[in-house]
């Protein structure tokens, strides 16, 4: 971003208001909805992005789970409470005083309750499985080329350290990207896998969060990779706590 007033923008988050009124005349950008100052050299947290998007229409989905503890975002959009660092607060409530606990990616991990509901800690989502189906192509993509391209994408576009891309699986037409990041592995300045997955999800839907950058143009050896559908599964360091009624 640049100090020249007309060009003071946030390359990594178009849902911001920017002005060169930061310290020393620095271009400073604040997330819409929350007014929190964001670091435009890296991804903005999913919580602040959801807060900025609060007026957007609901986007409810129901997904098949790969195992009993995997969570999916069935609840769609909501206006989250974020802490001063932009992380999700462990307990989220709506205007009708219905509350629930969320994980570090903001996905509900308990039954809904009232204001007496306690969420002792923000439980970290340490494993994310991104399940993609690509549009039909003349032939299957070469697995190692596909693996390399997706790793490059997460490294260069989302600035995610390569060590956090655990694996890329491929069985035409299904691609699975596994992201893993334990609390102990995440150093200061590391992009969170939840934020990278959210940016990727929005990119794939043609709703890029990047400022003025073209949409996602994924190519494997020149062949376009067009995604038909995306399912994202979230696994937490501590299994979620739902009543049996919900599981049946």
């Amino acid at each position: 971003h640049t100090a020249a007033q007309d060009n003071c923008t946030c390359p990594t988050n178009k849902m911001t208001v920017c002005s060169p009124d930061g310290p020393g005349g620095r271009c400073q950008c604040r997330a819409l909805g929350s007014g929190v100052a964001v670091d435009c050299s890296t991804l903005t947290s999913k919580c602040l992005l959801l807060k900025a998007r609060m007026s957007a229409p609901k986007n409810a989905r129901t997904l098949v789970r790969p195992n009993e503890h995997a969570l999916v975002d069935n609840d769609g959009l909501y206006d989250p409470d974020c802490d001063p660092e932009g992380r999700f607060k462990a307990r989220q409530c709506n205007q009708t005083s219905v509350c629930w606990c969320v994980n570090s990616v903001g996905v509900r991990r308990t039954d809904k309750g009232d204001l007496s509901l306690r969420c002792d800690e923000l439980v970290r989502t340490h494993h994310i499985l991104i399940d993609l189906r690509h549009r039909p192509t003349a032939g299957a993509f070469n697995h190692s080329d596909l693996d390399a391209e997706l790793r490059r994408l997460f490294r260069e576009r989302y600035r995610l350290h390569p060590k956090f891309v655990a694996a890329v699986h491929y069985e035409q037409p299904t691609i699975q990207i596994e992201l893993r990041q334990n609390t102990s592995q995440k150093a200061a300045g590391d992009v969170d896998i939840g934020d990278a997955a959210y940016y990727f999800e929005r990119d794939v839907k043609g709703e890029s969060l990047f400022q003025g950058r073209g949409g996602l143009d994924l190519r494997v050896r020149g062949e376009p990779l067009q995604v038909e559908r995306t399912l994202i599964y979230y696994l937490d360091e501590i299994p979620p706590k739902f009543s049996m009624k919900r599981l049946t």
């Epitope: 100090a3 007033q5 060009n7 060169p20 009124d21 930061g22 310290p23 020393g24 005349g25 620095r26």
Partner: antibody
Framework: QVQLVQSGAEVKKPGASVKVSCKAS????????INWVRQATGRGLEWMGW????????GYAQKFQGRVTITADESTSTAYMELSSLRSEDTAVYYC?????????????WGQGTMVTVSS | DIQLTQSPSSVSASVGDRVTITCRAS??????LAWYRQKPGKAPKLLIY???SLQSGVPSRFSGSGSGTDFTLTISSLQPEDFATYYC?????????FGQGTRLEIK
């Protein structure tokens, strides 16, 4: 070329005020903020405050709050720093500086400095 | 206010030497750090901004690194014009603050 040219040296008595000017040229004045930094002889750099000439927003270091006023005249592309209630410890070289084009809060263009001496 | 502490306060070196100056912030400042060189009677000159980005026109012998609280300015091979005072400066939060300076002298 891009430059900031400051007014000449000043000698003031304790309790008086001083107004230093900083004329910008070579770029669009209202596109960039102006910072003021001072340096006493043999000492380090001390940031005093800043102004965005387009919005009129200002920010001052707590130490100078109430004593310093930064203004700008768009028509002449000139910024001003006025320091009141002068004391001997305000004797210093006063610099104006422009933030870098990258918007990173670093100062890439500096004035040549104005020596202000406060002496009875 | 964020305090910036430079070390060493002064250093003696010879032309061709490699010199490293450090700047420690009292709290995290992300990468909002700049480095300047100042010669006697002159205004400071910007060398490095955003902790590691080289200012246009500055020789490549200057490099910066670090983020958070610990930062380094390295001059890979000292030239005669490099004997001066060096300052770090943060722009993470108001007020902008500078380090106390490091004097680089000829040995």
């Amino acid at each position: 070329q891009v430059q900031l040219v400051q007014s000449g040296a000043e000698v003031k008595k304790p309790g008086a005020s001083v107004k230093v000017s900083c004329k910008a040229s070579g770029y669009t004045f209202t596109n960039y903020g102006i910072n003021w930094v001072r340096q006493a002889t043999g000492r380090g750099l001390e940031w005093m405050g800043w102004m965005n000439p387009r919005s009129g927003n200002t920010g001052y270091a707590q130490k100078f709050q109430g004593r310093v006023t930064i203004t700008a005249d768009e028509s002449t592309s000139t910024a001003y720093m006025e320091l009141s209630s002068l004391r001997s410890e305000d004797t210093a070289v006063y610099y104006c500086a422009r933030p870098n084009t990258g918007g990173d809060g670093a100062f890439d263009i500096w004035g040549q400095g104005t020596m202000v001496t406060v002496s009875s | 206010d964020i305090q910036l502490t430079q070390s060493p306060s002064s250093v003696s070196a010879s032309v061709g030497d490699r010199v490293t100056i450090t700047c420690r912030a009292s709290q995290g400042i992300s990468s909002w750090l700049a480095w300047y060189r100042q010669k006697p009677g002159k205004a400071p000159k910007l060398l490095i901004y955003r902790a590691r980005s080289l200012q246009s026109g500055v020789p490549s012998r200057f490099s910066g690194s670090g983020s958070g609280t610990d930062f380094t300015l390295t001059i890979s091979s000292l030239q005669p014009e490099d004997f001066a005072t060096y300052y770090c400066q943060q722009a993470n939060s108001f007020p902008v603050t500078f380090g106390q300076g490091t004097r680089l002298e000829i040995k």
